[in-house]
């Protein structure tokens, strides 16, 4: 759960610890000054993109040692009652489709950070969410029918995907595996819309890591 | 420099094809969408196609849907507008150009090429 | 479609004269969707104005715009030889983006 304080911290990447580096030699440095944060991720960023891999290296090696630690953490972790533990997610299983929203996103992400290198992930997000609301209803559409088409072809991916694990479930018939369905989809729909803000989170981290512009 | 520089044009009979190029230097190319715009013979500006940064999304303007295909290879930094089914009221200067989004200012096109001459007559 | 009327068609003035050109929306237009283009004999059109009133780089402040929902002003305080031209306004509201016939600027 969010609040539970006997939750494991959750991975760093190489970059996050990089940061974390450079704020700390900042505070050295100056005790008493207050930090734009700003201006200090664009120059953490910009100096991230000037350092040769054996320099990254370090900071790989810290996540890499974080991940483990994470890892091994969670394994003995029990979250405490009444939260649902997460299931356990098939890789196989197929992917939730994205919003349009979603798909928006992934095709102005590397405008945004191209013309804004410094910006945290936070502010690229609220910059794109700016520009999506800044998009006219008409031009919103070829985004909705991608992502219309794309929830169509999860819907019967998925079906054909729960009947595959299921072998019984075509002698028990399709009604009661239509009211378990709807069900387990509401479940589903909460569990996949965390993993989507994981994996943009992810997503944002790696491109703040090979951020490139001319 | 930022620029654009427009190919293809030329004079092409009713019914026929034409392809536009549109090459961009000087900006990251990849990172924006892209127009053409048209201009008739002493005429105003009439705006024809989108296309998203990746290519994946385009749009047009119903006097071409169907006609015109709008592309763009963003290894070579290169935009295409391909006409078919060509008419004499496709006869203008095209245009292609950067949109450019201002934050909440909102969008404009900012860089404009040369133009290139479309003329389709018998 | 949202309509873009620009009035007058043409206006006629002298260098260091004020000129104000018009620009009517059909309907409402947001003021981050409109934008104003020059445009010289033979040239492609040059972006003055967005956002309705923020001058794009390089634009002298004897440009400016004004105006919101359906009415719109571009305002050149003092005119130059060089500003004698063809100006575009500019709406999106739609995909459609529609520019108006245009106002010719001409010297007395």
């Known amino acids: 759960g969010k609040g539970d304080p006997k939750k494991p911290r959750g991975k760093m990447s190489s970059y996050a610890f990089f940061v974390q580096t450079c704020r700390e030699e900042h505070k050295k440095k100056h005790p008493d000054a207050s930090v734009n944060f700003s201006e200090f991720s664009k120059k953490c960023s910009e100096r991230w993109k000037t350092m040769s891999a054996k320099e990254k290296g370090k900071f790989e090696d810290m996540a890499k040692a974080d991940k483990a630690r994470y890892e091994r953490e969670m394994k003995t972790y029990i979250p405490p009652k009444g939260e649902t533990k997460k299931k356990f997610k098939d890789p196989n299983a197929p992917k939730r489709p994205p919003s349009a929203f979603f798909l928006f996103c992934s095709e102005y992400r590397p405008k945004i950070k191209g013309e804004h290198p410094g910006l945290s992930i936070g502010d690229v997000a609220k910059k794109l969410g700016e520009m999506w609301n800044n998009t006219a209803a008409d031009d919103k559409q070829p985004y909705e029918k991608k992502a219309a088409k794309l929830k169509e072809k999860y819907e019967k991916d998925i079906a054909a995907y729960r009947a595959k694990g299921k072998p019984d479930a075509a002698k028990k018939g399709v009604v009661k595996a239509e009211k378990s369905k709807k069900k387990k989809e509401e479940e589903e729909d909460e569990e996949d819309e965390e993993d989507e803000e994981e994996e943009e989170d992810e997503e944002d981290e790696e491109e703040e890591e090979d951020d490139d512009d001319e | 420099e930022v620029q654009l520089l427009e190919s293809g044009g030329g004079l092409v009979q009713p019914g026929g094809s034409l392809r536009l190029s549109c090459a961009a230097s000087?900006?990251?190319?990849?990172?924006?969408?892209m127009f053409w715009v048209r201009q008739a013979p002493g005429k105003g500006l009439e705006w024809v196609s989108r296309?998203?940064?990746?290519?994946?999304?385009?749009y047009y303007a119903d006097s071409v849907k169907g006609r015109f295909t709008i592309s763009r290879d963003n290894s070579k930094n290169t935009l295409y507008l391909q006409m078919n089914s060509l008419r004499a009221e496709d006869t203008a200067v095209y245009y292609c150009a950067r949109l450019r989004y201002f934050d909440s200012r909102g969008y404009a096109f900012d860089i404009w090429g040369q133009g290139t001459m479309v003329t389709v007559s018998s | 479609d949202i309509q873009m009327t620009q009035s007058p068609g043409t206006l006629s003035l002298s260098p260091g004269e004020r000129a104000t050109l018009s620009c009517r929306a059909s309907q409402s237009v947001r003021s981050s969707y409109l934008a104003w283009y020059q445009q010289k004999p033979g040239q492609a059109p040059r972006l003055l104005i967005y956002?309705?009133?923020t001058r794009a780089t390089g634009i002298p402040d004897r440009f400016s715009g004004s105006g919101s929902g359906t009415d719109f002003t571009l305002t050149i305080s003092r005119l130059e030889p060089e500003d004698f031209a063809v100006y575009y306004c500019?709406?999106?509201?739609?995909?459609?983006?529609?520019f108006g016939q245009g106002t010719k600027v001409e010297i007395k």
């Open positions: 296309i998203s940064p990746s290519g994946g999304y385009t």
């Open positions: 956002g309705a009133s």
């Open positions: 000087g900006f990251t190319f990849s990172s924006y969408d």
């Open positions: 500019q709406q999106y509201g739609t995909s459609r983006w529609t």
